[in-house]
């Protein structure tokens, strides 16, 4: 009869590499008498005999994982015990190897030029796959703008037109390679005018062609505006080639005008617009009807800083040697004159003077100042500053004040354009944009009632806080 023999593991467990969905087997050969009981653990947790994911054969000496999963990674141990001597154990690791798999592939992207684009490419695999990108037919090279992130995603800073194209990501490890589907990166470009229309000085009855060329992605549409309104007459020809639109407006000239080319394209729900303007003037047009010469620029003075619309362009009159300084000096002097007027009148008068002296400006080849709307001028004259206006008119006939060198006329309200005729042709005074009900007392004026309706606009303030603290020294 055989003598009892304690168990000995003759083939210790080794590390097993296995691919996902493949079979993995651990062999634990044991010599002993009587026959041992063999149990198996994974990460110190007992594998149950009836677990259908495993097959245990050869009296427990053979453990087979029937279809390896990612989560099967770990340390497997077999323990043999037959009651003779102590139990013996051997352990080995299962390393689940996995061909690259793209779990979050890139998708088609539309992006506006200059923004940041991120194309995702999240991968799985063991060993961890390296991710590279292909644009068109060739490998994409990283640079200061283009980087493959740790996650595998492709990040492009400050997207340029030339970044548009077809992309795919490639995940690679020692077991294989996975490719994503091709995706499209479309770069949308804000509408931009390449060639602005040129100004013309022509004789009455001439034909003139204004040309405007714009680029963008998608290709922009071009519309034409004449003195602030849609062009009423004239023929338009358009030609589109390689994202560039060329529009030509042919006009029969019977009056001078400011013609604006507006290029627009759409990016999702938003639109981008570019504008360029040209003037058509008529030779020998009477001098009195010509615009004064000047230029449009940002107001950077002090006196009217809180009164003028922030960051708007204002008109500087080049009949002064130094327009910016001369106009600032005029308003500085006028402001001092206003110290004596009533609290009701002062802010309204300040708004009127600042917007009259620094008129809002439409840039172009011939910059055009935009006068104050007649209704606002009358509101100041006949409502807010009725007494003061009469007194000042008596003193200086046409103007608020005279200084040694300059004469600053108060605008003649009746000669100003009405906002009811063309709201875009004149400037509103923000100080007066409030409901007329907010006035509780009516200035006494010579006529029985004022000849003006204050524009009934949304309430912005119920009182006139005196605008900027400005110490005159």
């Amino acid at each position: 009869e055989k003598l009892p023999k304690a168990p000995v593991i003759t083939t210790p467990l080794e590390t097993v590499d296995a691919l996902v969905e493949e079979v993995a087997t651990f062999m634990c050969a044991v010599e002993s008498y009587p026959q041992p009981e063999i149990s198996w653990t994974r990460n110190k947790i007992l594998i149950k005999l009836f677990d259908t994911r495993y097959s245990i054969r050869e009296n427990g000496q053979l453990l087979t994982i029937l279809s390896v999963e990612d989560s099967d990674d770990g340390i497997y141990c077999c323990t043999a015990n037959n009651g003779v001597g102590g139990a013996v154990e051997s352990c080995g690791a299962l390393q689940v190897k996995m061909k690259p798999k793209i779990t979050r592939p890139p998708i088609n992207v539309k992006i506006i030029e200059g923004l940041k684009a991120v194309l995702p490419c999240t991968t799985m695999g063991n060993p961890k796959p390296s991710v590279s990108w292909i644009k068109g037919d060739s490998a994409l090279r990283e640079n200061s703008r283009i980087a493959v992130l740790e996650s595998g995603s492709l990040r492009i800073h400050n997207v340029q037109k030339e970044d548009a194209g077809q992309y795919r990501c490639v995940a690679k490890n020692s077991l294989g390679t996975a490719y994503s589907k091709l995706v499209k990166l479309e770069v949308e470009v804000f509408a931009r005018i390449l060639r602005a229309p040129e100004s013309h000085n022509v004789t009455f009855g001439s034909f003139v062609t204004l040309r405007c060329t714009a680029i963008g992605m998608p290709v922009p549409t071009i519309s034409w505006i004449e003195n602030g309104n849609a062009v009423s007459s004239g023929s338009i020809q358009e030609n589109v080639k390689d994202r560039v639109i060329d529009s030509r407006l042919q006009l029969f000239i019977t009056k001078p005008g400011l013609y604006t080319c507006i290029a627009t394209n759409k990016h999702g729900e938003k639109f981008s617009t570019a504008k360029a303007a040209a003037t058509v003037s008529i030779a020998e047009w009477s001098k009195s009807q010509k615009e004064s010469k000047g230029y449009c620029a940002q107001y950077r003075g002090e006196v009217c800083d809180a009164v003028l619309v922030k960051d708007s362009l204002v008109f500087f009159n080049t009949s002064y040697p130094d327009p910016e300084e001369a106009q600032e000096l005029l308003i500085h002097t006028a402001w001092n004159e206003l110290k004596a007027v009533s609290p009701l009148c002062r802010p309204a008068a300040e708004a009127l003077l600042c917007n009259h002296l620094f008129q809002e400006c439409s840039p172009g080849v011939l910059p055009t100042p935009m006068p104050i709307c007649r209704e606002y001028c009358l509101a100041v004259k006949e409502l807010f500053c009725a007494k003061e206006w009469l007194a000042m008119e008596g003193k200086t006939h046409r103007g608020l004040y005279r200084s040694g060198m300059h004469f600053l006329p108060v605008p003649e309200c009746s000669k100003l354009p009405s906002m009811h005729q063309d709201p875009t042709a004149c400037t509103r005074l923000p100080y007066l944009d409030y409901k007329k009900e907010n006035i509780t007392t009516f200035p006494s004026i010579t006529s029985s009632k004022p000849s003006v309706d204050i524009p009934n606009l949304p309430a912005s303030t119920s009182s006139f806080a005196v605008s900027p603290a400005y110490s005159m020294t």
Epitope: Q298, R300, D311, D322
Partner: antibody, heavy 121, light 112 residues
């Protein structure tokens, strides 16, 4: 002839204070905006602060806001820059400059010779 | 934060013409930035050449002219002379949010 003469520079420890002065002559001081401009050793020009002729407003570079104060005394034809909580990066030659007109941001059309401020422990 | 950009260095032959430019890291330079140009020789205070885009400061030779070219301000020196070798800075009025004035990094002009 327009003349601008800075003074008040010197060596100061980090966190310390200095007051620069600029004495102006040769023009009607109150009619012109003034500015301070600095230049760190071997570096370019950097606008620091501006004030209009009236002294009614003041403007500062973001990094000096709350630490520097520009002021002027039109009766003394003098421009000042009070510098508090000084840092090593404030080390520079500080120029006083006259603007071309009464506003704070006209062109800088006349410059002083500068005064050196060194912030070091 | 918007940065004012200039070419770090430029060279020109005596008698030649050179155009130095001044741009913005985002956006275009316009007349509303009132571009000014300054010249500085080592150890000296700066000297104003051009103000408000194209106005020449008194005493500045008409070899120096200012303009806006495309989306940048430009300083053109025609008939360059040896003593034009200097650092040139542009200054721009900036007005988004709060008013300030920003200099470019400067261009070192060498007259070879």
């Amino acid at each position: 002839e327009v003349q601008l003469l800075e003074s008040g520079g010197g060596l100061v420890q980090p966190g310390g204070s200095l007051r620069l002065s600029c004495a102006a002559s040769g023009f009607t001081f109150s009619d012109y905006g003034m500015s301070w401009v600095r230049q760190a050793p071997g570096k370019g020009l950097e606008w620091v602060s501006a004030i209009p002729g009236s002294g009614g407003s003041t403007y500062y570079k973001e990094s000096v806001k709350g630490r520097f104060t520009i002021s002027r005394d039109n009766s003394k034809n003098t421009l000042y820059l009070q510098m508090n909580s000084l840092r090593a990066e404030d080390t520079a030659v500080y120029y006083c400059a006259k603007r071309s007109g009464r506003i704070a941001f006209g062109a800088l059309d006349a410059w002083g010779q500068g005064t050196l401020v060194t912030v070091s422990s | 934060q918007t940065v004012v950009t200039q070419e770090p260095s430029f060279s020109v032959s005596p008698g030649g013409t050179v155009t130095l430019t001044c741009g913005l890291s985002s956006g275009s330079v316009t007349s509303s930035n009132y571009p000014d140009w300054y010249q500085q020789t080592p150890g000296q205070a700066p000297r104003t050449l051009i103000y408000s885009t194209d106005s020449r400061h008194s005493g500045v030779p008409d070899r120096f002219s200012g303009s806006i070219l495309g989306n940048k301000a430009a300083l053109t020196i025609t008939g360059a002379q040896a003593d034009d070798e200097s650092d040139y800075y542009c200054g721009l009025y900036m007005y988004s949010g709060s008013k300030n004035y920003v200099f470019g990094g400067g261009t070192k002009l060498t007259v070879l």
